[in-house]
């Protein structure tokens, strides 16, 4: 049984204010069962960026169909980028549990930074 790896291929993503940023995350295994969430930052103060199951995230859309049985692509797009969006983004796999899901593995993170404005 293959060990789950969380792949975030870009260490650094340069973005432009007002544009849409795509943050990539793929997994190498469908197991264990449980959701993948996106956070900015680490530790207790990290900010939830996207949770498919609950919450309202009007600027975030998924690249792939997260409800599909065999989906292994958890990449997201964030629209209308502002300077407040800079930071390091992590996709995090949770193992399904009761009563709460348990964090299982995190991707290495992608730092989002502002690039030069287009001339």
């Amino acid at each position: 049984e293959e060990e789950l790896q969380m792949i975030q291929p870009e260490k650094l993503l340069l973005v432009t204010v007002g544009k849409t940023a795509t943050l990539h995350c793929t997994v190498t295994s469908l197991l264990p069962v449980g959701p993948v969430l996106w956070f900015r930052g680490v530790g207790p103060g990290r900010e939830l960026i996207y949770n498919q199951k609950e919450g309202h995230f009007p600027r975030v859309t998924t690249v792939s169909d997260l409800t599909k049985r065999n989906n292994m692509d958890f990449s997201i797009r964030i629209s209308s980028i502002t300077p407040a969006d800079v930071g390091t983004y992590y996709c995090v796999k949770f193992r399904k549990g009761s009563p709460e899901n348990v964090e299982f593995k995190s991707g290495p993170g992608t730092e989002m930074a502002l690039g030069a404005k287009p001339s």
Partner: antibody, heavy 124, light 106 residues
Framework: AVTLDESGGGLQTPGGALSLVCKGS????????MNWVRQAPGKGLEWVAG????????YYGAAVQGRATISRDNGQSTVRLQLNNLRAEDTATYYC?????????????????WGHGTEVIVSS | ALTQPASVSANPGETVEITCSGG?????YGWFQQKSPGSAPLTVI????KRPSDIPSRFSGSKSDSTGTLTITRVQAEDEAVYYC??????????FGAGTTLTVLG
């Protein structure tokens, strides 16, 4: 109670197009993926097409790929299947199905409800 | 297509199992009962082992390794039907088995 009512079947001409509509009630339509399944006379079940709960993602069986379009209107609680360039092999009873809170289009293990079906006959 | 036996038979009151294999790597199975050709199928099990509220508890489903199993305990004459399994393949396409005809003897 959950109901799925299909309409739009009937006698169709080869090379023509058909549009089937399924109206769902008794459940939160926008929360469930939907699929179309057909059964030719004397044959088994065949998956035709599916669509995610929000309508962003669509899936098609090999027999209709390139000829079919599935879409949904969550406000009206309807899902539509359009099938072009009809062939005799498209003759079948077409069933609308609902996924039971898991999976998406094509994930047939998640089907928990079926419509009564609408019969389509493709003949000249 | 998924692989399931063409036919099974049982006496009333017996237990019968129908197997299904060939789903994708994240395979789960659903089971659909069709009592006569042209009549609408009925879901008896979905998502491996979930049972719709109107289905008797005599119907149960399970999955071991890559094989799904529909179990009907205390088989009754009214259970005579064709049972189809359904899943998705590794490409995500929907796929059914060819159907298993259950004959209730006696």
């Amino acid at each position: 109670a959950v109901t799925l009512d299909e309409s739009g079947g009937g006698l169709q001409t080869p090379g023509g197009a058909l549009s089937l509509v399924c109206k769902g009630s008794g459940f939160t339509f926008s929360s469930h993926a939907m699929n179309w399944v057909r059964q030719a006379p004397g044959k088994g079940l065949e998956w035709v097409a599916g669509i995610s709960s929000d309508g962003r993602f669509t899936y098609y069986g090999a027999a209709v790929q390139g000829r079919a379009t599935i879409s949904r209107d969550n406000g009206q609680s309807t899902v539509r299947l359009q099938l072009n360039n009809l062939r005799a092999e498209d003759t079948a009873t077409y069933y609308c199905t609902k996924n039971g809170g898991c999976g998406s289009g094509g994930d047939l293990d998640c089907i928990d409800a079926w419509g009564h079906g609408t019969e389509v006959i493709v003949s000249s | 297509a998924l692989t399931q036996p063409a036919s099974v038979s049982a006496n009333p009151g017996e237990t019968v199992e129908i197997t299904c294999s060939g789903g994708g790597s994240n395979n789960a199975y659903g089971w659909f009962q069709q009592k006569s050709p042209g009549s609408a199928p009925l879901t008896v099990i979905y998502d491996n082992g979930k049972r719709p509220s109107d289905i008797p508890s005599r119907f149960s489903g399970s999955k071991s390794d890559s094989t799904g199993t529909l179990t009907i305990t205390r088989v009754q004459a009214e259970d005579e039907a064709v049972y189809y399994c359904g899943s998705a393949d590794n490409s995500g396409a929907g796929v059914f088995g060819a159907g298993t005809t259950l004959t209730v003897l006696g």
